[in-house]
């Protein structure tokens, strides 16, 4: 899908399983071409996307791609759950796609559940 | 154009596994979902699970009990499926298949493997 | 799981005359981003399938304006125009909103 408008590029009903107390990026790839849009993060709760205001973010610039990175240091229990990446291009809004994270408790890492114990187990977003 | 290449044996021993692997052209598969769905002989489609080849993320559908492990090497652009403890009732024809995971622009099935569990 | 259900399961038809299959699913299928991802596949005699509708109406590249796609939430139909040699085999309907993802048991057109 080529055009010069501004493409995020989260896939549908993508997932990560990470681990509390260690650090994590999430990457929002931006394809734009003149003037790099304005992009947020915000994190589902339920129907409504709540923007994530006091976060640390970062570009990071690569050839062909941009990437609106949200940080997490550390990662905590409650950063489980969806999140999506917007941006603002001559007056529109772009959504990305939701992509979820699947948060394990540190104290449990021992036993920390595979990637499809975790998505199987959906209760864990809320 | 996306291609996709399955290989791997025509006949496995019931208790064995069953191993595919697909290799795709014409696309960087971890810009896609890729997919494995089997048909038994002269019945419907069934769904396996898939792989998001970008970072390994899988689902499985419960129907096989864990038996199911799909998994994907993006250097070589392919995924594989490995299916435990095979009976005669996992002979099928296995497709491998893969879409793109932000549009969904395109979905693109494999020519299909007729695997025959069989002492 | 979704269950997915065709009818009919065969469809004998005249060659120039038209189509339908109709396709229901037990619980909607519009997804958390508005859209719906209901696909229709069609499988020929000896080959692999491959998708000629998908998000309920559009048409894949290369697929016949003849193909056409409806429907919303659990009530889907695809529907041929003008049925052609090269469009007898059987076609599914399946959804990509939930998981596991779901077929229909198939619908097989013939000639009458």
């Known amino acids: 899908k080529e055009s010069c408008d501004v493409q995020l590029y989260i896939k549908r009903q993508s997932e990560h399983s990470i681990l509390a107390g260690d650090p994590f990026e999430l990457e929002c790839p931006v394809k734009y071409c003149a003037n790099r849009p304005h992009v947020t993060w915000c994190k589902l709760n339920g129907t409504t996307c709540v923007k994530l205001e006091d976060r640390q973010t970062s570009w990071k610039e690569e050839k062909n791609i941009s990437f609106f990175i949200l940080h997490f240091e550390p990662v905590l229990p409650n950063d489980n759950g969806s999140y999506r990446c917007s941006a603002n291009f001559q007056s529109n809004l772009i959504e990305s796609h939701s992509t979820t994270l699947y948060v394990t408790d540190v104290k449990s890492a021992s036993e920390r559940p595979s990637k499809d114990e975790m998505a199987s187990r959906p209760w864990l977003l809320y | 154009q996306v291609q996709l290449q399955e290989s791997g044996p025509g006949l496995v021993k019931p208790s064995g596994t069953l191993s595919l692997t697909c290799a795709a052209s014409?696309?960087?598969?971890?810009?896609?979902?890729m997919y494995w769905v089997r048909q038994p002989p002269g019945k419907g489609l069934e769904w396996i699970g898939r792989?998001?080849?970008?970072?390994?993320?899988?689902r499985y559908n419960p129907s096989f009990k864990s038996r199911a492990t799909i998994s994907a090497d993006k250097s070589k652009n392919q995924a594989s499926l490995k299916l435990s403890s095979v009976t005669a009732a996992d002979t099928a024809v296995y497709y491998c298949a893969v879409y793109d995971g932000y549009y969904e622009s395109f979905d693109v099935w494999g020519q299909g493997t007729l695997v025959t569990v069989s002492s | 799981d979704v269950v997915m259900t065709q009818s009919p399961l065969s469809l004998p038809v005249t060659l120039g005359q038209p189509a339908s299959i109709s396709c229901r699913s037990s619980q909607s299928l519009l997804d958390s981003d508005g859209k719906t991802y209901l696909n229709w596949l069609q499988q020929r005699p000896g080959q692999s399938p491959r998708r000629l509708i998908y998000l309920v109406s559009k048409r894949d590249s290369g697929v016949p304006d003849r193909f056409s796609g409806s429907g919303s939430g659990t009530d889907f139909t695809l529907k041929i125009s003008r049925v052609e040699a090269e469009d007898l085999g059987v076609y599914y309907c399946?959804?990509?909103?939930?998981?596991?993802?779901?077929f229909g048991q198939g619908t097989k057109l013939e000639i009458k």
């Open positions: 792989i998001d080849p970008a970072n390994g993320y899988t």
């Open positions: 014409g696309v960087n598969i971890k810009d896609t979902y």
């Open positions: 399946w959804q990509g909103t939930l998981f596991p993802r779901t």
